[in-house]
């Protein structure tokens, strides 16, 4: 018995293609590239029908439906734009992922262009079906930092957004009677990590051993400008407190630490990371000018409540910044060795300030970032962390501020943050 003539579906074909089909003949229905066989609302690659004994086909010819990649996956800190009208997501449609500029940029400068493949998957030429990654932009404040031509800026008010990496770290040990409270500064390195000085996060209850404060006692404020107004600031608790394993309380060698935030903070004009330097033992060159910001609240007679609640007795309600030159290492070493006491300026430290002194050399809080503008990458880089030399002898003649040389610890920092350096280096300094 002969079966009726078959008409292939639109965008499809039948094989074998014959003039006549008889009992027990079988045909395979398939679709063009970018289309799928649709039968009873079920998508398949091919569909087989057979000529029956009574001269009828075992099934109706299915249709060919264009492949649909459906809505593309959400990209954290990113946006999607459709290149086709009506936001089509079908075969050969194109979409473009982009990052929320200027706060994030795409890793490896990927184009972000994805095409809907015949397999129904969004595909990128480099990443395949993997989504791109939006990394925080670093060292590019939404407001331009002042030119570094003038020799000194003594205690100038910082405009909001000038130091978007600046963090206020509040430590409040409620297990002590009375509660022990202190503060320091830090620098945002990514949406989840703060760089600071180890001595800020060390419990002073123990002097023989180095013990970090409990993470429950740490609060970090970001985007804070005026301590009297915290409404615009983001506050976060700590998930981890990591002191450098070799931190030495005798001489503050390896005075560096990290705080991992409980939740990543949203980046914006007032909250942006600073860049890490390249790994270079020399550190910043002598006489280079850098900036340090702080609220000047290292005064031990000011309580946290006064800072965070009223801010009335702080040395400065508004974030201040100061411009300081890097001092040649030998000169700094000599200046400390000439004084009584066993002060040692190690190779993990550098000094900044002025020979003639002046209180402008100690506005930065402990742990705050000493940043230098990198001409090559056109970004601000954290070269130092406020470590010692103040506040106790703040601004004395020929008593320079001593800073942790961050460039000696780049590998350690990346290791703690769990990011391979090769992945993130392009966003740091290129």
């Amino acid at each position: 018995n002969e079966c009726p003539e078959l008409q292939p579906p639109v965008h499809g074909k039948i094989e074998p293609s014959q003039a006549k089909y008889f009992f027990k003949d079988q045909v395979l229905v398939s679709c063009d590239t970018g289309y799928k066989v649709l039968k009873d609302n079920v998508e398949m690659d091919t569909f087989q029908i057979e000529c029956l004994k009574d001269g009828t086909w075992s099934n109706k010819i299915p249709t060919c439906k264009i492949v649909d990649c459906r809505a593309p996956g959400e990209l954290e800190h990113g946006l999607i734009t459709f290149s086709t009208r009506n936001n089509l997501t079908t075969y050969k449609s194109e979409i473009k992922y982009s990052c929320q500029e200027p706060y994030y940029k795409m890793l490896n400068n990927n184009t972000g262009i994805y095409t809907c493949s015949a397999q129904g998957v969004w595909m990128n030429k480099v990443l395949g079906r993997s989504l791109p990654t939006c990394l925080p932009e670093c060292g590019q404040p939404s407001r331009s930092l002042p030119s570094l031509v003038k020799r000194i800026i003594g205690g100038r008010n910082a405009e909001p957004g000038l130091f978007p990496w600046q963090a206020l770290i509040v430590v409040e040990d409620t297990s002590r009677v009375p509660n022990d409270k202190w503060f320091g500064s830090g620098a945002l390195l990514s949406a989840s990590w703060i760089l600071t000085a180890a001595h800020v996060l060390r419990s002073q209850r123990r002097d023989t051993t180095v013990i970090p404060v409990s993470k429950e006692h740490v609060t970090v404020y970001l985007g804070l400008h005026d301590v009297r107004d915290k409404s615009g600031a983001v506050n976060s608790s700590a998930a981890r407190v990591v002191l450098h394993p070799d931190f030495n309380i005798q001489n503050y060698n390896h005075d560096i630490a990290l705080v991992q935030l409980q939740e990543p903070v949203p980046l914006g004009p007032h909250v942006m990371p600073v860049c890490l330097p390249r790994l270079e033992p020399e550190g910043p060159a002598p006489h280079m000018l850098g900036l340090v910001a702080g609220w000047g609240i290292s005064n031990p007679n000011v309580t946290v409540d006064e800072i965070i609640s009223s801010g009335t007795r702080t040395l400065s309600d508004v974030l201040q910044y100061v411009k300081l030159p890097v001092v040649p290492h030998a000169e700094c070493k000599t200046s400390y060795e000439s004084r009584s006491g066993n002060y040692s300026v190690t190779e993990n430290m550098f000094c900044a300030g002025y020979y003639e002194g002046g209180k402008d050399t100690c506005l930065g809080d402990s742990g705050g970032a000493f940043v230098i503008f990198d001409d090559l990458s056109q970004r601000w880089v954290v070269q130092g962390l406020v470590s010692w030399g103040g506040p106790e002898e703040c601004g004395s003649k020929q008593v320079y501020g001593v800073y942790t040389k961050v460039s000696n610890y780049v590998d350690w920092v990346w290791e703690q943050m769990g990011l391979p350096q090769s992945v993130v280096e392009p966003q740091v300094e290129r």
Epitope: W182, R205, D207, T208, N251, N301
Partner: antibody, heavy 116, light 112 residues
């Protein structure tokens, strides 16, 4: 070299106040807490408490709560012990010692005599 | 408060001979950080105290190696292998594990 230099001996009348100072040098002052220890004539040592030199927060042993106050002037690297409403039994040598718990360096001591 | 009990309260030693002082605490001095904050100091006549040993057995810099510390939990010992004339004074143990820190009553060492 690390040194803790205390103020000189004091002779006070009962009910008066005294302030003992302890100037520190030779180390990063805010790195170590400062303890205060009392030694009554012919007696042993008694720990009074300590002050966190970074935060300025004092902690007192129970026997020294009330009339005893630890304070700091960080700019001159000096902790202070103030005793108010002095009593005859406060007569003692008062030592400052570097560290909240370490007490690795000691001042030379300040004799406070309370006598009418 | 943790009670620190020293024995003997006084000790008369011939120069060159060994000496041993015991210090017992009313509670274990092992802290939650796995360290034992038991220390020894010497107060020479008319002088301020000087720490000799910290964390049970670690010698402070400049302390002669004839001094040694040992012990764990609640029982601790300071030993002087060969007593010298400059070792006279009162030896105190103290603990920095449990607040408030407490001292032993002292052991007076003199030369025969």
């Amino acid at each position: 070299q690390i040194q803790l230099v205390q103020s000189g001996s004091e002779l006070k009348k009962p009910g008066a106040s005294v302030k003992v100072s302890c100037k520190a040098s030779g180390y990063i002052f805010t790195s170590y807490g400062m303890s205060w220890v009392r030694q009554a004539p012919g007696k042993g040592l008694k720990w009074m408490g300590w002050i966190n030199t970074y935060s300025g927060v004092p902690t007192y042993a129970d026997d020294f709560k009330g009339r005893f106050v630890f304070s700091l002037d960080t700019s001159v690297r000096t902790p202070y012990l103030q005793i108010s409403s002095l009593k005859a039994e406060d007569t003692a040598v008062y030592f400052c010692a570097r560290g909240g718990e370490a007490m690795d360096y000691w001042g030379q001591g300040t004799l406070v005599t309370v006598s009418s | 408060d943790v009670l620190m009990t020293q024995t003997p309260l006084s000790l008369s030693v011939t120069p060159g001979q060994p000496a041993s002082i015991s210090c017992k605490s009313s509670q274990s001095l092992l802290d939650s950080d796995a360290k034992t904050y038991l220390n020894w100091l010497l107060q020479r006549p008319g002088q301020s105290p000087k720490r000799l040993i910290y964390l049970v057995s670690k010698l402070d810099s400049g302390v002669p190696d004839r001094f040694s510390g040992s012990g764990s939990g609640t029982d601790f010992t300071l030993k002087i292998s060969r007593v010298e004339a400059e070792d006279v004074g009162v030896y105190y143990c103290w603990q920095g594990t449990h607040f408030p820190w407490t001292f032993g009553q002292g052991t007076k060492v003199e030369i025969k």
